[in-house]
């Protein structure tokens, strides 16, 4: 079953390489157990950045590795990407399944450009 | 604090009908399935029904298709149980039960008799 | 419908001493999402169900770490480490994996 879900449709990404952004899907309903997916899309390639499943009661970090970190609360998930190069630059998109209990919904959002711009390196001092 | 409270159950001739009722409190109840679970007297415990109570979406195990009816009202915080058709194997105490991975919580559960 | 199958019925155990119920499935009780929604219910006589494990072996919220769960597939059991007075009670295994979800029988424990 088809369901909504929202991200921003711009955000830069930090001089560190790192970028956030919310992820709002339409209702939890009684879904105990959701699993957030965020896929790059490069051209016609889609590829998985990171996943998990979370737990709606635990309103905690659910995700939490090299390249992503994520919070929940309520219909909302809050993601960041971390490590991002310019060449990372690319549409980022939010996919958000209600996994358990049935009925399963799905949902992807349009996806959120971020654009990453890589520091200049310091000039050397004398 | 999270309550469940039934209330409804009655001497019921064969072939009567009841409908049960359980009030929810101290919680959203949309976010929660929920389910009536019942036990005959000296037996063990019988998944009824639940009702996905966002969608209204309702699911039964097959011994009660077509004779009983999970509904719920939403604005009232209420869970209903309609019983078409009483059997006397459909004496038990039936509790309602919030369905949940971690925070599950049960009524008191309330007693229904059909004898003649 | 998953027809979920607890033996023993009944056991008498001293207080101390382990017990162990055992839950079979007439089939695979692994969801789409690859977790088993398998729980154990206590019920004391005169009382409403308690949950004592959800996903197979996690416990619920102030269940003593005498009582365990494991299992998968179609195979799981409930352990108690040393059984205490107040353990007395019907045992229920659950399957929430598959509608209609489904209670096992139930196994009666008896301090001896």
């Known amino acids: 079953k088809g369901m909504h879900a929202a991200q921003p449709a711009v955000v830069l990404a930090s001089s560190r390489g790192v970028a956030s952004f919310v992820c709002e899907y339409g209702s939890s309903g009684n879904a105990a157990e959701v699993r957030v997916t965020m896929l790059r899309q490069a051209g016609s390639q889609m590829t998985e950045v990171c996943a998990a499943t979370y737990t709606v009661e635990d309103e905690l970090a659910f995700l939490d590795d090299s390249t992503c970190t994520g919070t929940s609360s309520g219909n909302k998930v809050n993601l960041t990407i971390q490590g991002l190069r310019a060449m990372g630059t690319g549409l980022y998109i939010c996919k958000v399944e209600l996994m358990y209990p049935p009925p399963y919904y799905v949902g992807m959002g349009n996806g959120t450009q971020i654009y990453v711009i890589d520091p200049e390196p310091c000039p050397d001092s004398d | 604090e999270v309550q469940l409270v039934e209330s409804g159950g009655d001497l019921v001739k064969p072939g009567g009908s009841l409908r049960l009722s359980c009030v929810a409190s101290?919680?959203?109840?949309?976010?929660?399935?929920m389910n009536w679970v019942r036990q005959a007297p000296g037996k063990g415990l019988q998944w009824v029904a639940w009702?996905?109570?966002?969608?209204?979406?309702?699911t039964y195990a097959d011994d009660f298709k077509g004779r009983f009816t999970i509904s719920r009202d939403n604005a009232k915080n209420t869970l209903y149980l309609q019983m078409n058709s009483l059997r006397a194997e459909d004496t038990a105490v039936y509790y309602c039960?919030?369905?949940?991975?971690?925070?599950?919580?049960w009524g008191q559960g309330t007693t229904l008799t059909v004898s003649s | 419908d998953i027809v979920m199958t607890q033996t023993p019925l009944s056991l008498s155990v001293s207080p101390g001493e382990p017990a162990s119920i055992s839950c079979r499935s007439s089939?695979?009780?692994?969801?789409?999402?690859?977790?088993?929604?398998l729980e154990w219910f206590q019920q004391k006589p005169g009382q409403s169900p308690q949950r004592l494990i959800y996903?197979?072996?996690n416990r619920f919220s102030g269940v003593p770490d005498r009582f365990s769960g494991s299992g998968s597939g179609t195979d799981f059991t409930l352990r108690i480490s040393r059984v205490e007075a107040d353990d007395a009670g019907v045992y229920y295994c659950?399957?929430?994996?598959?509608?209609?979800?489904?209670f096992g029988g139930g196994t009666k424990l008896e301090i001896k």
């Open positions: 009702i996905n109570t966002y969608t209204g979406e309702p």
């Open positions: 101290g919680y959203t109840f949309t976010n929660y399935g």
């Open positions: 659950f399957q929430g994996s598959h509608v209609p979800w489904t």
């Open positions: 089939q695979s009780i692994v969801y789409s999402n690859g977790n088993t929604y």
């Open positions: 039960a919030r369905r949940s991975i971690y925070y599950p919580y």
């Open positions: 996903k197979v072996s």
